[in-house]
Amino acid sequence: MAVTACQGLGFVVSLIGIAGIIAATCMDQWSTQDLYNNPVTAVFNYQGLWRSCVRESSGFTECRGYFTLLGLPAMLQAVRALMIVGIVLGAIGLLVSIFALKCIRIGSMEDSAKANMTLTSGIMFIVSGLCAIAGVSVFANMLVTNFWMSTANMYTGMGGMVQTVQTRYTFGAALFVGWVAGGLTLIGGVMMCIACRGLAPEETNYKAVSYHASGHSVAYKPGGFKASTGFGSNTKNKKIYDGGARTEDEVQSYPSKHDYV
């Protein structure tokens, strides 16, 4: 009962986590214009992994996609890759874990197979969560570095006459969503791995022992009791490899220079 609960809870937690990772990846607010100690502007800038947006005080919002692959910072490309790998692994993990759920009966699937699948999905969730946390953390580090760089030259004077304000960016909502979602996926994966131990069939059978009482010839043959000794020799861990995910910006828009964080 506890095993089923742990497995079910692990699945639900991972499902929420992966939904969060997907949401974070799609969100535009990875970095937002820093409003603290800044000249108050009637324009608010924020940026995501795929496009940058500007919201005017009037309410008008304009977003422009990064319609270039080679022109983007390597760090941004790395963050995109980490998030996509996290989503792909998580999605496959969810698919595997559905069939591994103890409460779902599929033909004559043995408990050992379910245990294997539970462990596989658990590992996938752990890696997925780590990818998301790593992606968000890399982006956050990039923001912090650029924040202090732009603070150092907050106002860049032009001939001592004109001042140009440099927009500083700080952590956006997507970063927090990503961290929480990555953490949940990680926790869900650990729960699946714990549930796997309980699902594993007990393999060791005790041999029948004959006891000879004096004068009588009575044989006691206990049945094949199973002891919990972890994984049996027939348990194989399946490895699922990600064939690599590729995204392309499909809609063409007017080109623009993007001051990326």
Partner: antibody
């Protein structure tokens, strides 16, 4: 079409307060912001403040302490209240709908306010 | 506050002539996020409220004749009237729409010779 109709007193005594109402039609206050601008006779334009679609406001820091802008979405009305008026507050007061680029796309006809004893 | 400096303060022209007026801001009005300049031009005729001509420094408001052209970026902006008509005689104001408070220039008065 978009219209902004202003109503308010023409004459205000010094140290008294001013209240002007801007009634809009042809657009919703839940979608657009409204700004207030004034123009002293024979002089240039001065932005007073604005109330945005979400209800948040921004004011000219020089007038912030005596200025208040609020709105009633259901009645399509925006209200400007200014306290402690002095003779140099004599001006034509305009309300305007805010459009693209935070520009003032449509203007009211204006309310001439004279501060005099 | 951002200071908007317009020049000349007045301009005497003849009908059909090409006119340019300048507007300079004390800080750049270019937003790096969308590469738009938050500068607006208005036309005000005597006894009338101002009328929007150009926003985002160069985008003409619908219904505005194409003889009006806005240009410039950062801190230096220009309004050009390719062929002045009698109905164009008015005061032209530029406005900072980027920093609060939203400030106006003192205006350029266009008069007929």
């Amino acid at each position: 079409q978009v219209q902004l109709q202003q109503s308010g007193p023409g004459l205000v005594a010094p140290s008294q307060s001013l209240s002007i109402t801007c009634t809009v039609s042809g657009f919703s206050l839940t979608n657009y912001g409204v700004s207030w601008i004034r123009q002293p006779p024979g002089k240039g334009l001065e932005w007073l403040g604005a109330i945005w679609a979400g209800g948040n406001t921004n004011y000219n820091s020089a007038l912030m302490s005596r200025l208040s802008i609020r709105k009633d979405n259901s009645k399509s009305q925006v209200f400007l209240k200014m306290n402690s008026l002095q003779t140099d507050d004599t001006a034509m007061y305009y309300c305007a709908r805010v459009g693209y680029g935070n520009s003032f796309a449509n203007w009211g006809q204006g309310t001439l306010v004279t501060v005099s004893a | 506050d951002i200071v908007m400096t317009q020049s000349p303060s007045s301009l005497t022209v003849t009908a059909g002539e090409k006119v340019t007026m300048s507007c300079k801001s004390s800080q750049s009005l270019l937003n790096s996020g969308n590469l738009r300049n938050y500068l607006t031009w208005y036309q005000q005729k005597p006894g009338r409220p101002p009328k929007l001509l150009i926003y985002w420094a160069s985008t003409r408001e619908s219904g505005v004749p194409d003889r009006f052209t806005g240009s410039g970026s950062g801190t230096d902006f220009t309004l050009t009237i390719s062929s002045v008509q009698a109905e164009d005689l008015a005061v032209y104001y530029c406005q900072n729409n980027y920093f609060y408070p939203l400030t106006f220039g003192a205006g350029t008065k266009l008069e007929l010779k």
